[in-house]
């Protein structure tokens, strides 16, 4: 190698200014003798290069771009060789920005999984390569007192979720969790959540059924509907509230909501619909009265109501 | 401190009844599950039925389905078990206990013994 | 029904020794599992719940793993007043059974 660059950082902040240094060995005594070192950003020659001999014989150029504005770009230092151009030495720039401080940090206890899924917003665009890191620990009290650390939970690339396995959860007790960004240029950190998993727990919907009508029960009356739910398997022990939502299937009309109803109740005869109508219903449950999340709404159920009951009117004949 | 204190066991022929009391204190009773379990003499446990915070649903293990029922007053704090038409078979230690939301017997009480014999 | 089969029924052991004893559900239960420990003429006494959680006021020398079917109640380090019977109970369904127990006695 004839040449060498060194920068004084091979990453900065967008903007900031950045100097290069290109040596050339006295030993490539093909070479001119007196070669006039040439700087080229991209495809760009650039200007402005301080060109020195040095004791030793080599040649040095000192160049200072006094604003990165690409996030990346080749620079490299080149002597005028014949009719060409002839690359002594290249290297890597990048430019960008610290990582902003993640926000909007949320989490969900999924029974299912058995996992707590953790989501956050990264903030804008650093332009580098940015790692997160979900951080968590136990903590016996509000979280002022940090206990035992948790495993951190690093996402796949690109994504901003990560999920804490079971095994690594302490349910009914507190666990503090923030997000930590990183990259050349900095860190920063989420403010902390401090959360017991099961505060967070969302539950699945129950599965709306049409009532199994039985011999000794009277029918819906007209403009009623009778639903029955299975409740969700995980959820089985814990207390929920729920509501229904209905709207006709056909038309414009907008969701019409009941509730709360208990999920305990699982059967409700819903009354005052249109007769002879074809309605759509789902239910959603939470979490109650300890805290949680509410269910996504259920898979539809499709129901009609009954006719209205024919009336019988009286002809008087008059003689 | 959470505390949970059966009553009612005692001797009976079969074919006779009783009735179980367990009286709650120091949790909010209207909140939880609660159930029975039982052990007979020398044997492991068996679940014998349970019943939701306000409850609307108690099921039951098939080997007490018909004869057992399961109730609560929440104004009292306190869970009953009727038992009826009992069997020689009945016969072991009935623990009451407190079930978490994950279905777990977190708390139990002493258990009282009831003896089924002619 | 979900059957609970615990094994081994009884095990000796000395203190200082690592105790493991497994159940396995009929069906999958997910991590609706607990852990029980009973001494003679008392109740029982929540150890684990939902599989892996420690009971508050457990020691930390027991631990519980698995979903699924198969779960494990491990003991790293056996003392004198963990000499008594442990049972396993699901409670993914209403119908909340419980392993047969496995006594584990001073050898």
């Known amino acids: 190698e004839c040449g060498h660059i060194s920068v004084s950082a091979p990453i900065v902040h967008l903007g900031d200014p950045i100097t290069a240094s290109c040596i050339i060995k006295q030993n490539c005594s093909h070479l001119d003798p007196e070669p006039q070192i040439l700087w080229r950003l991209g495809a760009e020659l650039q200007p402005g290069g301080r060109q020195q001999r040095l004791s030793d014989g080599t040649q040095e150029s000192i160049i200072t771009l006094p604003h990165l504005n690409h996030t990346q770009a080749f620079l490299s230092c080149a002597l005028n060789w014949g009719n060409s151009l002839q690359i002594l030495d290249q290297v890597e720039l990048r430019a960008g920005y610290p990582p902003a401080i993640p926000h909007n940090l949320s989490c969900l206890m999924n029974l299912t999984t058995s996992s707590l899924i953790c989501q956050w917003e990264p903030g804008p665009e650093t332009h580098l390569p940015t790692s997160f890191t979900l951080k968590s620990f136990k903590s016996r009290g509000n979280c002022q007192t940090q206990g035992d650390s948790i495993l951190d939970c690093v996402p796949k690339d690109g994504q901003s979720h990560c999920s804490i396995p079971r095994k690594h959860l302490l349910l009914y007790q507190n666990m503090g969790i923030w997000v930590q960004a990183e990259n050349a240029l900095g860190t920063s950190m989420s403010p902390q959540l401090c959360l017991d998993p099961m505060d967070v727990v969302k539950l699945e919907p129950p599965m709306l059924r049409t009532m199994d009508p039985s011999p000794e029960a009277a029918p819906p009356q007209a403009g009623c509907l009778q639903l029955s739910w299975e409740p969700w398997q995980p959820g089985l022990h814990i207390n929920q509230k729920c509501e229904l939502r209905h709207k006709p299937q056909r038309g414009e009309a907008s969701w019409a909501l009941v509730g709360p109803l208990p999920l305990e109740a699982l059967q409700y005869e819903l009354c005052g619909l249109l007769p002879a109508t074809a309605y759509t219903l789902q239910i959603r449950c939470i979490r109650w009265p300890l805290p949680g999340h509410w269910s996504d709404w259920s898979p539809s159920l499709e129901l009609r109501t009954t006719e209205r009951a024919p009336t019988h009117h009286h002809h008087h004949h008059h003689h | 401190e959470v505390q949970l204190l059966e009553s009612g066991g005692g001797l009976v022929q079969p074919g006779g009844s009783l009735r179980l009391s367990c009286a709650a204190s120091?949790?909010?009773?209207?909140?939880?599950?609660m159930g029975w379990v039982r052990q007979a003499p020398g044997k492991g446990l068996e679940w014998v039925s349970s019943?939701?915070?306000?409850?609307?649903?108690?099921p039951y293990a098939d080997s007490v389905k018909g004869r057992f029922t399961i109730s609560r007053d929440n104004s009292k704090n306190t869970l009953y078990l009727q038992m009826n038409s009992l069997r020689a078979e009945d016969t072991a230690v009935y623990y009451c206990a407190k079930l978490g939301e994950l279905g777990m017997y977190m708390n139990w009480g002493q258990g009282t013994l009831v003896t089924v014999s002619s | 029904d979900i059957q609970m089969t615990q094994s081994p029924s009884s095990l000796s052991a000395s203190v200082g020794d690592r105790v493991t004893i497994t159940c396995r559900a009929s069906?999958?239960?997910?991590?609706?599992l607990n852990w029980y420990q009973q001494k003679p003429g008392k109740a029982p006494k929540l150890l684990i719940y939902y599989a892996s959680n420690l009971q508050n006021g457990v020691p930390s020398r027991f631990s519980g793993s698995g979903s699924g079917t198969d779960f494990t109640l491990t003991i790293s380090s056996l003392q004198p007043e963990d000499f008594a019977t442990y049972y396993c109970q699901q409670s993914w369904t209403y119908g909340q059974t419980f392993g047969g127990g496995t006594k584990v006695e001073i050898k």
């Open positions: 019943i939701s915070s306000s409850g609307g649903v108690t």
């Open positions: 069906q999958g239960i997910s991590s609706y």
């Open positions: 120091g949790f909010t009773f209207s909140l939880y599950w």
